[in-house]
């Protein structure tokens, strides 16, 4: 279960040590530190697991670890979605769940964990190199997409640790704008801090409600990880790409292994490190994706309809209005 | 607003084929999937099969594969289903239903066409 | 496939009333259900999803309810264009699979 950050209760300063004034500017530094404490930087981890029973059976798992609400999860395979990759799934926390040969079942298995169940045979079936991931569409964080393999050594039965694979891709900057917001607060939080230095603390109450979910932690890679396999994009397996089925992926054609996006913003930036050690990687910034590309005037490739991004997955009249209506 | 205009009445032969158009409006056609169902008389509504406007991928219920045929016409934001070989089992009324991401609901339904199947 | 049952076929009620339609799923559909009606002149609109969701434009006196496989629709205050054949719809795999129906009827 995520737990919400919660603004620690303040404490009113003693009568006469300060004028309004005072009380303003000794408020808003604690409400900045909130601010940026809880600001960490989400995550995205993905598992992938063959099953020993069936060979051609894999289950991907994927996981959201951030404060937001997730108003769309995308599962694909070959690479991330957009960038050469086929869409094997849509979960949306209310609107439904979708999924396309040679997936079989989709599901939530926590409000912000999904696992996707992969069958097939001979062609359509995934292989043990085939790359998946996992894009997470969140408010207030924006989206966020890992991917994962199963390691070359892995028996059947076994499954890759959970890999929050960074993923160097930016389709828009529209997130950059909330975080140059909090990158500011937090220098004029340090800034009123030095002015206020003399000044007590203010008081806190503890909190009362749960600790703070699992936040993703910086981290600076190992050599392990750096020696992790390193794949472009554009190196999509065609030893194991689908064969063309009647219930069609969402996009492309047979020759979805070549769909690279036409525009340079969804092109990938470099190599995707896929982990093979089970410590948690930065999490992987891709874009912010609310009103769908609305202020790039384009839309994600392969994506279909336009999705208000709502903040509570479980809000009210959640997905009202006619979707992408003039 | 949404509008999803379906073709006329259509009468036709066993053994014969028809093909009903679905007409978009007020919306990104390229935005919704395009659903099929089926209402037979008396009884309950069908899922045929979806079809994505963007590049005409299709999926369908294992049911009506090899009956129905599902394409679009991007270019006039036109929904077509084409039914073959008609029994008199195919007799009903037919909806085009546009559905959105992540392309399950039927947010916005056509008024239906009616297929009579008779000699 | 997974199965939708609406054991009440036909329903009659007077205007006013406040008017409960069951439909039961034969596995979990994790409150991924819908409701639709087709009303006497054949027209068809999405009602509720994701089991008590209002679609935008539908009055207030719907609402829907139901967890795991047993699902209602509630209708508090029957309206005489609330006459129709309400469905239920399960969207949580393919193929889309829809309830029998349950007709609407006055009193």
């Known amino acids: 279960m995520r737990t919400e950050a919660q603004v620690p209760a303040l404490q009113p300063p003693e009568p006469g040590l300060e004028g309004a004034m005072g009380h303003r500017t000794l408020v808003l530094p604690w409400v900045l530190l909130t601010l940026c404490v809880t600001a960490g930087t989400p995550e995205v981890w993905v598992q992938v697991r063959m099953e020993a029973t069936e060979l051609s059976s894999f289950t991907i798992r994927c996981g959201f670890l951030g404060s937001g609400s997730i108003s769309l999860v995308t599962v694909s395979w070959g690479g991330p979605n957009g960038a050469g990759g086929t869409t094997l799934a849509v979960l949306h926390p209310e609107r439904g769940i979708r999924q396309w040969a040679p997936a079989r079942q989709a599901r939530w298995e926590t409000q912000s964990s999904i696992s996707l169940i992969l069958e097939g045979s001979g062609a359509s079936s995934p292989c043990a190199n085939t790359t998946f991931c996992c894009k997470f569409a969140s408010f207030p964080e924006g989206s966020w997409e890992a991917c994962g393999s199963l390691p070359p050594s892995s028996d059947p039965g076994l499954s890759a640790p959970p890999t929050p694979a960074p993923i160097l891709r930016a389709d828009l900057a529209g997130i950059l704008g909330v975080s140059g917001v909090l990158l500011f607060g937090c220098v004029y939080l340090l800034h009123l801090l030095r002015r206020h230095k003399h000044r007590p603390a203010p008081r806190l109450q503890p909190s009362r409600t749960s600790p703070q979910a699992p936040r993703a932690r910086a981290w600076a890679p190992s050599q392990a990880s750096q020696a992790a396999l390193h794949v472009p994009y554009a190196t999509i397996n065609t030893s194991c790409r689908p064969a063309t089925l009647d219930t069609a992926h969402p996009h492309g054609g047979p020759s979805w292994w070549a769909s690279l996006p036409t525009h340079a913003a969804h092109r990938p930036q470099g190599p995707a490190a896929w982990a093979s050690t089970p410590i948690p990687a930065r999490g992987s910034f891709v874009s912010v994706e609310n009103g769908l590309y609305a202020q790039a005037g384009e839309r994600p490739p392969h994506t279909g309809p336009g999705l208000t991004l709502f903040p509570d997955p479980r809000g009210p009249r959640a997905m009202e209005g006619p979707l992408g209506v003039r | 607003e949404v509008q999803l205009q379906q073709s006329g009445p259509e009468l036709v032969k066993p053994g014969a084929s028809v093909k009903i158009s679905c007409k978009a409006s007020g919306y990104t056609f390229t935005d919704y999937y395009m659903s099929w169902v089926k209402q037979s008389h008396g009884k309950s509504l069908e899922w045929i099969g979806d079809v994505n406007p963007n590049n005409g991928d299709t999926s369908y219920n294992q049911k009506f594969k090899g009956k129905a045929t599902l394409t679009v016409d991007k270019s006039s934001s036109t929904a077509y289903m084409e039914l073959r070989s008609l029994t008199s089992e195919d007799s009903a009324v037919y909806y085009c239903a546009a559905s959105g991401l992540p392309y399950v609901l039927m947010d916005y339904w056509g008024q239906g066409t009616s297929v009579t199947v008779s000699s | 496939d997974i199965q939708m049952t609406q054991t009440t076929s036909s329903l009659s009620a007077s205007l006013g009333d406040r008017v409960t339609i069951s439909c039961r799923a034969s596995q979990d559909i994790s409150n991924y259900l819908n409701w639709y009606l087709r009303k006497p002149d054949g027209t068809v609109k999405l009602l509720i999803y994701y089991s008590s969701r209002l679609h935008s434009g539908v009055p207030s006196r719907f609402s829907g309810s139901g967890s795991g496989t047993d699902y209602s629709l509630t209708i508090s205050n029957l309206e005489q264009e609330d006459i129709a054949t309400y469905f239920c719809?399960?969207?949580?795999?393919?193929?889309?699979?829809f309830g029998g129906g349950t007709k609407l009827e006055i009193k």
């Open positions: 719809q399960q969207g949580n795999t393919l193929p889309r699979t």
